[in-house]
Interface confidence: low
Amino acid sequence: NWVNVISDLKKIEDLIQSMHIDATLYTESDVHPSCKVTAMKCFLLELQVISLESGDASIHDTVENLIILANNSLSSNGNVTESGCKECEELEEKNIKEFLQSFVHIVQMFINTS
């Protein structure tokens, strides 16, 4: 499922090229392995901002599908409790392009450890 998440992120990246969305999103660009689940949940929350701001049905569908796949993959990790991790609001705000690049990196972390 994580591989499908990456292809969805690439699709979102392609779809937003033609749009002017100037939102900044809370982005964890240096994910510590012991905080990867917490960081992933922040990425998923912020992804919904793209869906709302784009107002585009294709982006909305892709975002929704990505969230299903990611949450399902996270649930197979069990109920992991991580402590000492940053809250979403403590993260740096970055533009959509940088946000999506960091998102791909964290998904790759999950692929490499699964």
Epitope: N1, Q48, E64, N65, I67, I68, L69, N71, S75
Partner: antibody, heavy 120, light 112 residues
């Protein structure tokens, strides 16, 4: 009207596989998830997994991961659920159900159920 | 996984009397969009489950208005204003916020 028609009852030996079909009609097959839910005799409902027929993406409950395969054939508007390495605890009625696409799609229409009996 | 807990297990009711079933989730089902992702189903004897209420409070088309749903967050209630003989069966709540979709253990409504 919207309908999901499932294949007939199956009796299987432990260790074998079963494949249950679910034919959809009365709506656009690719606009909705197809979920699979099972119910052991005298027990409650348990979600097995689901498929997005438009994309072929599947999601599963952790306990079935690696043992269940869910597929969809767009040309016949039919979804399939295959469960392998069957054991007696898999004896249940298996339902397919339509769910809205997206994270929060409500599961609104159910098939009539397929009884799978696993017995030596 | 989100755990759904229903009560009571069994509910004997006299026709014409009201009935109430409680469902509690182990975490909030209230999404940031304002909807609670909690659905109610009735499984009549020998039949497939049928949807009664979705998003905690919205009555499914064709379902009699004697059924109503309330609640938010982690506590939800299904009410039947006047029970009829055809309402017998097992009632299930289900959370649709995230996979795995999870169901309550069921409440068996029977006529006294």
């Amino acid at each position: 009207q919207v309908q999901l028609v499932q294949s007939g009852a199956e009796v299987k030996k432990p260790g074998s596989s079963v494949k249950v079909s679910c034919k959809a009609s009365g709506y656009s097959f690719t606009d909705y998830y197809v979920h699979w839910v099972r119910q052991a005799p005298g027990q409650g409902l348990e979600w097995v997994g689901g498929i997005n027929p438009k994309r072929g993406d599947t999601v599963f409950a952790q306990k079935f991961q690696g043992r269940v395969t869910i597929t969809a054939d767009e040309s016949t508007s039919t979804a399939y659920m295959e469960l392998s390495s069957l054991r007696s605890e898999d004896t249940a009625v298996y339902y397919c159900a339509r769910g809205g696409l997206g994270v929060f799609g409500v599961v609104d229409v159910w098939g009539q159920g397929t009884t799978v009996t696993v017995s030596s | 996984d989100i755990v759904m807990t229903q009560s009571p297990l069994s509910l004997p009711v006299t026709p014409g009397e009201p009935a109430s079933i409680s469902c509690r989730s182990s975490q909030s089902l209230l999404h940031s969009n304002g909807y609670n992702y909690l659905d109610w189903y009735l499984q009549k004897p020998g039949q497939s489950p049928q949807l009664l209420i979705y998003a905690a409070t919205t009555l499914q088309s064709g379902v009699p208005d004697r059924f109503s749903g309330s609640g938010s967050g982690t506590d939800f209630t299904l009410k039947i204003s006047r029970v009829e003989a055809e309402d017998v069966g097992v009632y299930y709540c289900m959370q649709a916020l995230q996979t795995p979709l999870t169901f309550g253990g069921g409440t068996k409504l029977e006529i006294k």
